[in-house]
Structure formats: structure tokens, C-alpha cells
Interface confidence: low
């Protein structure tokens, strides 16, 4: 479902590279000329998820059964129990606590698996390249299991997965087949199993963009199960705008608003831009170009 967005990510990445743009995800539609600086509870490190669906709210569905299930709570960053009604719902639903942890928590990253060559690598080395849903494109490295090499890719700045390294060397050390095989101790020092940041600890640069709004703003538009054709709006987190879609009249998810205004109110304020020291970069839409000096590189933030 959410993985169908990957081509869109790739398209955005190429567009941004061609235009030399680092677009601001807060860019709501042009009629809304506002500045947004969001300050939220920042004690925890930026949350990066192994799978986008881990950000979905627990959804018991419309049916009336009482089934014990587990979901990943993005606020507590833990797998928690909920009661599932037995039908519909979403992908953030697991039969067991273990399955939930395996899919959504980074504790699982500390499990070491054996490759066919009997060399040990962390599970995340086998995850596909994932730029995430944001658009603050920065260069990162991932292990390509097809070529068995670490390669460069453009990371959007939020979400994505753990196959994401700041340096080529770091990626090689953790995921490539070295002369002495994979060193468990090296890996242990690279990653902190306590926090749920889902990034290598040695990655000193936090996400350029983080999402702090309601989790359903991250979900794709869902027509639902019925046959009506109602005009609704959903928040497209890839482009940071509210877009129309046809709702069937039942089912679907919470990313479903009767008006564009309501959609914008609910979702557009959720993005913040971060700088390395935990400060904020204000994104003003009035300015054509805003030069933003960041500790690790200089980029241009320009509205699309």
C-alpha cells in the first residue's frame, strides 16, 4: 500500500536534484501565506521507522469482535496492546508483541543474522533503499544487497529505514563483506539499542525534517470499500499539500477531510525543519530564497 509511493519518492528526488532545490515540506497551497515553526517535546531523538505503517494509529476497524492485537505507538515508541474488531483496520497490527517489535522497533536491529557466506550482518542491511516521505534531500549511503556494495542515495530527511548511513565508510564497516568478516563488537558500538532513533549512532546529523503532527497525515489516500464517489481531501505527505480524492463512502482511513481547509489545519503544521544543534530553521514562504547554513553542509531552501 504505502510502498507504491516509492516511485514518487524517486521522482521527487530527481526533480529536486535537477532543479537544485531542497523544497520545504511545509509548503502548503499558495493561498496560505503563513510561517510555521513548530516546537514540540524533543527529549526523544528523531523517530525513524523501519516501515512507514508503524506510524499509523491503532485502528480497531468497524467490526465488533474482541481480538487482542499489538501496534507500534509512535508516541511511546513501544509496541502496545489494543483490541481489534476483526476486520479492516490497517497494517500497524500484529498477532504478537514479538512480531510487532520485529517490524517496528529497533531492538530487532540488534539481532544478527547469518548470510549465505556465514558472515554476520544486521537485518537492516537487507532493507531496500528508502528515501522516506520528506523532501529535505541529503546524501546518504545504503547497502545494496543486489550489488553487495554500499551505494549513494538521496535521503528525504525523515522516516525511511535503518539502511541509511552518513558516510560510505560507515556503511561498508557495518554491511559489506570485509576481509575479516563482520565484527559484532564494531556494530555494538555503532548502535545504541536503548533509543529508538533507528539510525546508526555515529550519524551526527539529525533529520532535516521531522513530522510531529497526527500520524494519519502520513497515510496514503484510501478510497474505502463502498461505491459512492464523494469529494474528499487527503494530506499528501510527499508534496506537503492537501489533494482531492474520491471517497467511496465507507472504510478508508483518517486521512480523509471534507474540505481542503480542514485538511490543511489538521496536517500542515506537523513538519518542522531541524538544524544540527537541535535548533529550528524557520521556513518563510514569502521569501523566494533562504540561505540556511547547517553544520555539515550549506544548502538552499527554496519554495517549489
Amino acid at each position: 500500500m504505502i510502498y507504491t509511493m516509492k516511485k514518487v519518492h524517486a521522482l521527487w528526488a530527481s526533480v529536486c536534484l535537477l532543479l537544485n532545490l531542497a523544497p520545504a515540506p511545509l509548503n502548503a497551497d499558495s493561498e496560505e501565506d503563513e510561517e510555521h515553526t513548530i516546537i514540540t517535546d524533543t527529549e526523544l531523538p528523531p523517530l525513524k521507522l523501519m516501515h512507514s505503517f508503524c506510524a499509523f494509529k491503532a485502528d480497531d476497524g468497524p467490526c465488533k469482535a474482541i481480538m487482542k492485537r499489538f501496534f507500534f505507538n509512535i508516541f511511546t515508541r513501544q509496541c502496545e496492546e489494543f483490541i481489534y474488531g476483526g476486520c479492516e483496520g490497517n497494517q500497524n497490527r500484529f498477532e504478537s508483541l514479538e512480531e510487532c517489535k520485529k517490524m517496528c522497533t529497533r531492538d530487532n536491529a540488534n539481532r544478527i543474522i547469518k548470510t549465505t557466506l556465514q558472515q554476520e550482518k544486521p537485518d537492516f542491511c537487507f532493507l531496500e533503499e528508502d528515501p522516506g516521505i520528506c523532501r529535505g534531500y541529503i546524501t546518504r549511503y545504503f547497502y545494496n544487497n543486489q550489488t553487495k556494495q554500499c551505494e549513494r542515495f538521496k535521503y528525504g530527511g525523515c522516516l525511511g529505514n535503518m539502511n541509511n548511513f552518513e558516510t560510505l565508510e560507515e556503511c561498508k564497516n557495518i554491511c559489506e563483506d570485509g576481509p575479516n568478516g563482520f565484527q559484532v563488537d564494531n556494530y555494538g558500538t555503532q548502535l545504541n539499542a536503548v533509543n529508538n532513533s533507528l539510525t546508526p549512532q555515529s550519524t551526527k546529523v539529525p533529520s532535516l525534517f521531522e513530522f510531529h503532527g497526527p500520524s494519519w497525515c502520513l497515510t496514503p489516500a484510501d478510497r474505502g470499500l463502498c461505491r459512492a464517489n464523494e469529494n474528499r481531501f487527503y494530506y499528501n505527505s510527499v508534496i506537503g499539500k492537501c489533494r482531492p480524492f474520491k471517497y467511496s463512502g465507507c472504510g478508508g482511513n483518517e486521512n480523509n477531510f471534507t474540505s481542503k481547509q480542514e485538511c490543511l489545519r489538521a496536517c500542515k503544521k506537523g513538519f518542522i525543519q531541524r538544524i544540527s544543534k537541535g535548533g529550528l530553521i524557520k521556513t518563510k514562504r514569502k521569501r523566494k530564497k533562504q540561505r540556511v547554513k547547517i553544520a555539515y553542509e550549506e544548502i538552499f531552501v527554496k519554495n517549489m
Epitope: 496560505e32 501565506d33 510561517e35 510555521h36 513548530i38 505507538n73 489545519r265 489538521a266
Partner: antibody, heavy 120, light 107 residues
Amino acid sequence: EIQLQQSGPELVKPGASVKVSCKASGYSFTDYNMYWVKQSHGKSLEWIGYIDPYSGGTSYNQKFKGEATLTVDKSSSTAFMHLNSLTSEDSAVYYCVREGNRYDERFTYWGQGTLVTVSA
Amino acid sequence: DILLTQSPAILSVSPGERVSFSCRASQSIGTSIHWYQQRTNGSPRLLIKYASESISGIPSRFSGSGSGTDFTLSINSVESEDIADYYCQQSSSWPLTFGAGTKLELK
């Protein structure tokens, strides 16, 4: 009818803590965020933070971070605000407030307020 | 933080007069402003949402206008029950902030 019923006035000593409660009725408690607002005597209103009763997720005004802790008890549809290490600056009326629609951050439904007086 | 400046601090009116309250934001906030009335010893009450949208149950004599940085709440014919403090609040960005208020009193 939507109602927010807050706990009664509190007289506490400096350095102590207090827990203000807000019992919600007339709507599905977990469907809407609960906000807390401070009003010092003769002064304006300040947003403290909010809690999503569904998940327990919170967001605080940086000014009140560390001072206020927001929690909920879903079984009784009650929101709580715990204020610690109180000083005279914390003497105020505290309101629990429910938003009109999800995440729209306009304050449609207000509790009657709880007066907290910090005095030796 | 977005600073909301309300003026004047006190407004003296006679019943039946039209009165306007001003609220100015330190930066553009679109129409993300809401107006509240607070009578003595009472809780605030929402009067106008999103700068100009009316609220059910609120008398039609209350209206709002403005966008960007300048906003106005108007009462087209003041009644004695309108004597209260009036506050604006922005929901454009966190932290949510309120103006210092304008006190409406009878001449």
C-alpha cells in the same frame, strides 16, 4: 451535552506539587485532544500543552516543559495535569479545554477552571 | 513565538454602540485566529473561529475580519451582557499564543 468538570481549588505550599483533574462527558474522550491553559490573576491566557487521550502522546509549550505533566485515565474519561515544585508564579486558574475538531487548536469547550494558590 | 498585540487595553462604550477590537500578529498567520469572550469569574467562550467564521449559539452581532497580521472583532450593537474581557488566539504555529486581552466596559 459536552462538559468538562474540573477538580476544586487547591491551596499548596511552595515546593509542593498538585494534580488537577478534568472529567470529560458528552463525547468520545479519546477522539479529541485535551489542552490545558493557565490564567494568572488579572492576566492573559497561556497554553501549557495538550495530550492525545487515544495514545497518551503529549506536546508542551517549552515554557512549561518540566513543570507540567499531562496524563489521562481513559477508563474514567479524565485528564490530569500534575504541577511540581510550585512557586508563587504558579498561582493561577488552570483550565482544561477541548478543541472543536481534531487538531484544529481552537478551544471550543472549557472546564470551569481550577484555582491553584501557592502560599506559605 | 508569535506575539499577539491587542489594542486598546480598555474600551469604554455605551449600550447600542458599535465597537471594534484589534489584534495584531508579529508575523503572518493567514486566518488562524480565534476570538474569545471572558466574563468576570467565568471561563472563556469561543466567539469567532478562523478570523471570520461564526460559532453556533453566538449572537450575530459578533463578527470578525482580517487575515495575515491584522484582525478585528466587532460587536455591531453592544449590549450590557457583552461587558467582558476579549482575547485573540493564534493556531498557526506552536506554541499556541493568546493576546493580552481588551477589557470592554460601560461608560
